[in-house]
């Protein structure tokens, strides 16, 4: 028995609107119905989290009114969305995914996304 | 899947010792790193200590009176606390994470990693 596996893409480089997705997938060993997706950074040998969201198996994934992540579930894929990232944010983002509910609980790991931000170069002044 | 039972809390006086245990089921505990945490009354779940397949880490204020080693064979892990302080009086959690390659010396003890929690075992350092 070996810990549950998830994939996700191992670059994304996020939008000149600081904007970046990617997918977190998992093989699911038995039919969980609530799930808990947890995104995290390391940077600087720091680890952080990003943001969290549990969801039933079938229902949309809710994270927090104030959270920088949005997010859509679909089967054992969930699709996530960071917002509001600047160059600064640039690191390893990993999913981690909870089988939470029914038992046996779950754990799985992935082996992180680095996700690429460049700040946009302001625009010139122009007389036009 | 992982199961933990952890083991061998109690009442000890300062300058002594205990030796707490963590025993997996369902899993060989080799593509995992194991931890040990503590939670003191009023204050947030902190590392102790973490061992993978090849390393070992220590939070500071523990590094020269604990020891983390693991059984491989046994399916076990043990923290040995040495010279114990007041200031170890916890409750102290066993807790499990996938070995990642993106771990290292300063982040594969972090909480945010781990799950398969254990209910945890008393650690009371007192005269």
């Known amino acids: 028995c070996k810990a549950m596996h998830v994939a996700q893409p191992a670059v994304v480089l996020a939008s000149s609107r600081g904007i970046a997705s990617f997918v977190c997938e998992y093989a699911s060993p038995g039919k969980a119905t609530e799930v808990r997706v947890t995104v995290l950074r390391q940077a600087d040998s720091q680890v952080t989290e990003v943001c969290a969201a549990t969801y039933m198996m079938g229902n949309e994934l809710t994270f927090l009114d104030d959270s920088i992540c949005t997010g859509t579930s679909s089967g054992n894929q969930v699709n996530l969305t960071i917002q509001g990232l600047r160059a600064m944010d640039t690191g390893l983002y990993i999913c981690k995914v909870e089988l939470m509910y029914p038992p046996p609980y779950y754990l799985g790991i992935g082996n992180g996304t680095q996700i690429y931000v460049i700040d946009p170069e302001p625009c010139p002044d122009s007389d036009f | 899947e992982v199961q933990l039972v952890e083991s061998g809390g109690g009442l000890v006086q300062p300058g002594g010792s205990l030796r707490l245990s963590c025993a997996a089921s369902?899993?060989?505990?080799?593509?995992?790193?194991i931890g040990w945490f503590r939670q003191a009354p009023g204050k947030g779940r902190e590392t102790v200590a973490c061992?993978?397949?090849?390393?070992?880490s220590y939070a500071d204020s523990v590094k020269g009176r604990f020891t983390i080693s693991r059984d491989n064979a046994k399916n076990m892990v043990y923290l040995q606390m040495n010279s114990l302080r007041a200031e170890d009086t916890a409750v102290y959690y066993c807790?499990?994470?996938?070995?990642?390659?993106?771990?290292?010396?300063?982040?594969?003890?972090?909480?945010?990693?781990?799950?398969?929690w254990t209910q945890g075992t008393q650690v009371t350092v007192s005269s």
């Open positions: 807790a499990a994470s996938p070995d990642k390659p993106f771990y290292t010396d300063q982040t594969m003890c972090n909480k945010h990693y781990y799950g398969y």
């Open positions: 061992i993978n397949r090849s390393r070992t």
């Open positions: 369902g899993s060989t505990l080799d593509p995992f790193v």
